[in-house]
């Protein structure tokens, strides 16, 4: 077990920023509670990539090309308070990637592709208090999607394409009720209803035709 | 590891404001939460608001809310907590501190001692 | 808010004893109890997070454990150093909450 040459390690934290890794490092020190990766040139995350860390509290890869993330990733990460993934490449969120992060409080998803969100993505989140989802390619957002989030404070869902039909009413809904959505969240379409904020429109114009 | 320094010691008349500062040295802190947490002489330890600097949006406790306004610079790596309205009960000692998530608070600045008397 | 009771408020030891401090939650918050150590003058030091884990470079004299509303924090054997308040802190739901604290004087 070692620290990687080009980076630094110190009271568990493993710090290697800015160092253009392509991969994540291996066989560090299962002791550690915080891996910091910004700013490197990383495409994938590996299967079980973390597991064997399994106290960590924080993981930061934000800023890498990540366009793959496998289903295991994170598994079993039972103490993670925050995950960092704001701009990278990421298209979807594969099924159970969030599995088990019951510790999880920050989720950082912004400035990335993703065009979809599964129904049970966040199921286990039950503790977040922060999720960002600002600056993707969402549509739109399937009903009972944030149900898990009972510990919600703060939403980021601005700077995504919504369709702002009948699919989205729930949404207007749920914003209405919860006024967490903090960054502005506005509809792209139908035309009537383009450039208005989500959380600010009567649920009855959300239509289908 | 990320470390702490806030300003100095102020002294203030009631109703006035003032503005803490808490500078991150050895480590950047645009993605981490920043909290404050003041302590009145002899008192124990009050949690008053946090911001996730590269977001700008905080988050604050009702105690103080419309009082107190957290900003973050992120071009200097500074926090700041801004109280207006100050009564002789707001002399305390005010912390920032950083963590993992919202509500842990791993490293914590020196203090800044802020007095409220006429 | 989750109201935090310490007991008890103070207490005096002798080097090498065992100290047991307690903390409950006025309602259940797992195991989302974070403790620290606080000295004259000093900002708090991180102790221990979730309950049980300890936070680098923290003696293992030190430890905690419970879940739910009933936690404890134990020294096996009192150091000078460890001559300070402590407190735990509640990090389930907003606002984070602290207990009053508990003085460990010498006797």
């Known amino acids: 077990l070692h620290c990687p040459a080009a980076c630094t390690c110190s009271n568990n934290i493993v710090d290697c920023r800015g160092k253009g890794l392509t991969e994540i490092p291996t066989n560090l020190p299962e002791t550690i509670t915080e891996i910091r990766l910004e700013q490197n040139t990383i495409k994938v995350i590996p299967p079980g990539a973390f597991s064997p860390y399994k106290k960590l509290r924080r993981i930061d890869l934000s800023n890498n090309q990540i366009s793959e993330l496998a289903p295991d990733a994170f598994q079993g990460l039972r103490s993670l308070n925050s995950l960092v993934l704001y701009g990278n490449k990421i298209t979807e969120l594969p099924k159970s990637l969030f599995e088990g992060l019951f510790s999880l409080q920050l989720l950082l998803l912004n400035a990335n592709k993703i065009n979809c969100l599964r129904v049970d993505a966040f199921q286990d989140l039950h503790n977040l208090n922060l999720l960002s989802l600002y600056d993707n390619k969402l549509q739109t957002i399937a009903k009972g999607t944030f149900s898990p989030l009972r510990a919600i404070q703060t939403m980021h869902l601005a700077q995504n394409p919504f369709i702002c039909d009948c699919h989205l009413k729930w949404l207007a809904d749920y914003l209405h009720t919860n006024p967490i959505e903090t960054s502005g969240a506005r509809c792209t379409s139908p035309r009537r209803l383009a450039n208005k904020r989500i959380g600010q429109i009567k649920s009855k114009k959300f239509r289908c035709s | 590891q990320v470390q702490l320094v806030q300003s100095g010691a102020e002294v203030k008349q009631p109703g006035s404001s003032v503005k803490v500062s808490c500078k991150a040295s050895g480590g950047s802190f645009r993605s981490y939460t920043v909290s404050w947490v003041r302590q009145a002489p002899g008192q124990g330890l009050e949690w008053m608001g946090g911001?996730?600097?590269?977001?700008?949006?905080?988050n604050y406790a009702q105690k103080f809310q419309g009082r107190v306004t957290i900003t973050a610079d992120e071009s200097t790596d500074t926090v700041y907590m801004d109280l207006s309205s100050l009564k002789s009960e707001d002399t305390a000692v005010y912390y920032c501190?950083?963590?993992?998530?919202?509500?842990?608070?791993?490293?914590w600045g020196q203090g800044t001692l802020v007095t409220v008397s006429s | 808010d989750i109201q935090m009771t310490q007991s008890p408020s103070s207490l005096s030891a002798s080097i090498g004893d065992r100290v047991t401090i307690t903390c409950r939650a006025s309602?259940?918050?797992?195991?989302?109890l974070n403790w620290y150590q606080q000295k004259p003058g000093k900002a708090p030091k991180f102790l221990i997070y979730?309950?049980?884990n300890l936070q680098s470079g923290v003696p293992s004299r030190f430890s905690g454990s419970g879940s739910g509303t009933d936690f404890t924090l134990t020294i096996s054997s009192l150091q000078p150093e460890d001559f300070a308040i402590y407190y735990c802190q509640q990090s389930y739901r907003s606002p984070p909450t602290f207990g009053g604290g508990t003085t460990v004087e010498i006797k």
């Open positions: 911001i996730i600097p590269i977001f700008g949006t905080a």
């Open positions: 309602q259940n918050i797992n195991a989302y």
């Open positions: 979730a309950a049980s």
């Open positions: 501190a950083t963590g993992s998530g919202w509500y842990t608070f791993d490293y």
